[in-house]
């Protein structure tokens, strides 16, 4: 789950579960910073606007990131 805190990592727990790119409203990738030493990925789902913290090391999540970036590159002129 994500938690809104200013000087800490956002994610308290992370999920390995694959996410269907079509069910994604938004995908936030927060790079490492002075506040949090590792990358954080927060998915917002279309259904109910539910959010989920994703495990950047998970194979399923890496595949999701590839699929999303491919989709974006198709859309951009």
């Amino acid at each position: 789950i994500p938690l809104s805190r200013t000087v800490r990592c956002t994610c308290i727990s992370i999920s390995n579960q694959p996410v269907n790119p079509r069910s994604l409203e938004k995908l936030e990738i927060i790079p490492p910073s002075q506040f949090c030493p590792h990358v954080e990925i927060i998915a917002t789902m279309k259904k109910k606007g539910e959010k989920r913290c994703l495990n950047p090391e998970s194979k399923a999540i890496k595949n999701l990131l590839k699929a999303v970036s491919k989709e974006r590159s198709k859309r951009s002129p």
Partner: antibody
Framework: QVQLVESGGGVVQPGRSLRLSCAAS????????MHWVRQAPGKGLEWVAL????????YYADSVKGRFTISRDNSKNTLYLQMNSLRAEDTAVYYC??????????????WGQGTTVTVSS | EIVLTQSPGTLSLSPGERATLSCRAS???????LAWYQQKPGQAPRLLIY???SRATGIPDRFSGSGSGTDFTLTISRLEPEDFAVYYC??????????FGPGTKVDIK
């Protein structure tokens, strides 16, 4: 199967220390935030502390802040609660609970059986 | 700090009856952040409802949650003998503490 087992409870004098442990099995412990929740005899549930999956984030109830420390060892699949300067009002059953990671907030979906701490002179 | 109030303190009902439990917050809680737990004597709590209205895995459909803002409700449509227990609501706001309500005891009339 998914399981949490607490240990380390006992009878201790006021002002002394105790360390509780919670052994996790059956799930990817290193992905999950973990909580300690306590229940005084005949009373309701009181949230005590939370630690993030990676040990970076720690949060405490005001009643234990500065006295209790939550920690974890992901290589041993174990959660800890170091309790210092214990008071009579810390007497309770202490539960560890898993923060369910599959959503923004899905509650504490797995609980241990609890370990009893009695603070008495 | 958000304070949760549960009512009634005790609910005396018979098996087969409908139970309606209330949880009120001192300030608005996002419905994503509200959960309900059941606890039987000598046992650990069990997650029933998360996100105010979603049933946890394995929870029978006679349990339902509703509400938003400051008022939330847990309904048990037809009480089974195993449903007599204490029920707690809990909020998980954008920052701790993650407070529990004082509980509602559902006992046999």
């Amino acid at each position: 199967q998914v399981q949490l087992v607490e240990s380390g409870g006992g009878v201790v004098q006021p002002g002394r220390s105790l360390r509780l442990s919670c052994a996790a099995s059956g799930f990817t412990f290193s992905n999950c935030g973990m909580h300690w929740v306590r229940q005084a005899p005949g009373k309701g549930l009181e949230w005590v502390a939370l630690i993030g999956f990676d040990g970076i984030n720690e949060y405490y109830a005001d009643s234990v802040k500065g006295r209790f420390t939550i920690s974890r060892d992901n290589s041993k699949n174990t959660l800890y609660l170091q309790m210092n300067s214990l008071r009579a009002e810390d007497t309770a059953v202490y539960y560890c609970a898993r923060d369910w990671p599959e959503g923004y907030y899905n509650g504490m979906d797995v609980w241990g059986q609890g370990t009893t701490v009695t603070v008495s002179s | 700090e958000i304070v949760l109030t549960q009512s009634p303190g005790t609910l005396s009902l018979s098996p087969g009856e409908r139970a309606t439990l209330s949880c009120r917050a001192s300030q608005s809680v996002s419905s994503s952040y509200l959960a309900w737990y059941q606890q039987k004597p000598g046992q650990a709590p069990r997650l029933l409802i998360y996100g105010a209205s979603s049933r946890a895995t394995g929870i029978p459909d006679r349990f339902s949650g509703s509400g938003s803002g400051t008022d939330f409700t847990l309904t048990i449509s037809r009480l089974e003998p195993e449903d007599f227990a204490v029920y707690y609501c809990q909020q998980y706001g954008s920052s701790p503490p993650f407070t529990f309500g004082p509980g509602t005891k559902v006992d046999i009339k």
